[in-house]
Interface confidence: medium
């Protein structure tokens, strides 16, 4: 009764520069098989809840499980397989014909950056020719999910997007985040950021790619209309961006409450919780309604601002109306006004 | 650091039913998913029951609609509740908590085992 939660399971994640995502590939007695992400009785285009995946990413030395879902683009190899049964069961599987398969895709977090990174993989700067435009988004090593430097690729050619500041590309943008699966534009990232600057131990060949584009209509609806090909610029800005869907979020939790659903807002960064201070941005329930969601407890009764005489008490501060807009916190090393929240309690 | 323990073990007549709990401690927070595992004498660990943080489930074939996982994330504990119990459950029953680490890692953390007889 094979399940990926087994200690002999083997698993892969192929087509992408990093072992840490991409088409999750399993070995079953015969050999190496695309999994369909038909399988289990989903339809091709249902994501997961990504925690249920927790032991391959653990297996492939990779962090936290980030998103379970469909793969962007589907590679079909000889084999694909259909499974039946539990999510992440492979007991009972079977042979699918390769036009009816989209791939199975997992994104784990990158595990913590300890060795120069290897040079990028064949796969991921020169696709088969016949592949469709795809884009990718390259974050920096341990960096987040749907934040990063855009690529574009078509055909064998792939490569970054130059981007001017005045450039009104909105709609572009959104329509990007949404190509990648991962949600809507919610602001340019400085390249920095976005970990585009050449890290010193880098190796000289991940160096930029050959290919620049150059934005061409910023109201395409599909890929291939998007960009025209530019000659590499030495210097100038390339577009990056952070989408909705960037992980991992800011998680909360309720702190010295009678119940899991009243308490002090607590946030964490890291491994670390500290208080979320007050903002003004935040004067409104949004922001606690989401906290409430986020504890499955029902919505906010009330919040209030705790005083804080303390000159010297800290906590973290987040500038957006809501935490899920949040993808940094600011640490507050004085005045740190705690809120206390109280949520209907769906088990009194 | 997270610990797991495990209580509800003992000895039941088949058809019977026990409750297992699993208490975790420390930085429960960090917990990711958590799972019941089982190992009968001469024989492999394997899957019983495991749950995610949103609260799905995956069960082992031969315990569906007999055991139920819970979860209760506030207070960090997992329960099994074993229902129709068969004497091939005879076992030692593990806790299993995935937990998140520094830069993301998981490590896994195991309780020491209860152990479930069912006598026929």
């Known amino acids: 009764r094979l399940s990926w939660y087994d200690p002999d399971f083997q698993a892969r994640l192929t087509r992408s520069n990093s072992k840490c995502q991409g088409q999750l590939e399993v070995y079953l007695k015969d050999g190496w098989h695309m999994v369909c992400s038909q399988s289990w009785g989903r339809s091709s285009k249902q994501w997961e809840d990504p925690s249920q995946a927790s032991k391959v990413c653990q297996r492939l030395n990779c962090g936290v499980p980030l998103s379970l879902g469909p793969f962007l683009v589907t590679y079909t190899p000889q084999s694909s397989i259909i499974c039946y049964g539990q999510l992440g069961s492979f007991s009972n599987c079977s042979h699918s014909r390769n036009d009816m398969c989209h791939s199975l895709g997992l994104t784990c977090l990158e595990p913590q950056k300890t060795t120069p990174p290897t040079t990028r993989p064949p796969p991921t700067t020169t696709p088969e020719p016949t592949a469709p435009p795809r884009l990718q988004l390259v974050a920096q090593s341990g960096g987040q999910h749907c934040a990063g430097v855009v690529e574009f690729y078509s055909g064998s050619l792939g490569g970054t997007i130059s981007y001017e500041a005045q450039d009104k590309t909105q709609d572009l943008e959104n329509f990007l985040c949404n190509n990648l699966q991962c949600g809507s534009f919610l602001k340019h990232l400085p390249e920095t950021e976005a970990g585009r600057a050449q890290d010193p131990g880098e190796p000289r060949e991940h160096q930029p790619l050959p290919i620049q584009w150059k934005i061409q209509n910023s109201s395409c609806t599909s890929l291939e209309h998007c960009f025209r090909k530019i000659k590499p610029q030495k210097s100038g800005r390339v577009l990056a961006l952070l989408c909705s869907g960037f992980q991992p979020k800011v998680q909360s939790r309720l702190v010295g409450g009678s119940s899991i659903c009243e308490g002090t807002v607590e946030v964490r960064q890291g491994a670390q919780w500290a208080a979320l201070c007050d903002s003004s941005s935040a004067r409104s329930s949004l922001r606690w309604e989401e906290v409430c969601r986020e504890q499955q407890c029902g919505s906010v009764n009330s919040y209030r601002v705790l005083d804080a005489g303390d000159p010297t008490s800290r906590g973290l501060f987040c500038p957006h109306q809501k935490l899920s807009q949040c993808h940094e916190l600011w640490e507050r090393n004085s005045y740190c006004k705690k809120v206390f929240v109280t949520c209907q309690d769906p088990n009194p | 650091e997270v610990q797991v323990v495990e209580s509800g073990g003992g000895l039941v007549q088949a058809g019977g039913s026990l409750r297992l709990s699993c208490a975790a401690s420390?930085?429960?927070?960090?917990?990711?998913?958590m799972g019941w595992y089982r190992q009968a004498p001469g024989k492999e660990r394997e899957v019983v029951a495991a749950?995610?943080?949103?609260?799905?489930?995956y069960y082992e074939d031969s315990v569906m609609g007999r055991f139920t996982i819970s979860r209760d994330n506030a207070k960090g504990t997992l329960y099994l509740q074993m229902n129709g119990l068969k004497p091939e459950d005879t076992a030692v029953y593990y806790c299993?908590?995935?937990?998140?680490?520094?830069?993301?890692?998981?490590?896994?953390?195991w309780g020491q085992g209860t152990l479930v007889t069912v006598s026929s």
């Open positions: 299993n908590a995935d937990t998140v680490v520094g830069g993301g890692l998981l490590t896994e953390v």
């Open positions: 420390g930085s429960i927070f960090s917990i990711n998913a």
């Open positions: 749950i995610s943080n949103g609260g799905n489930t």
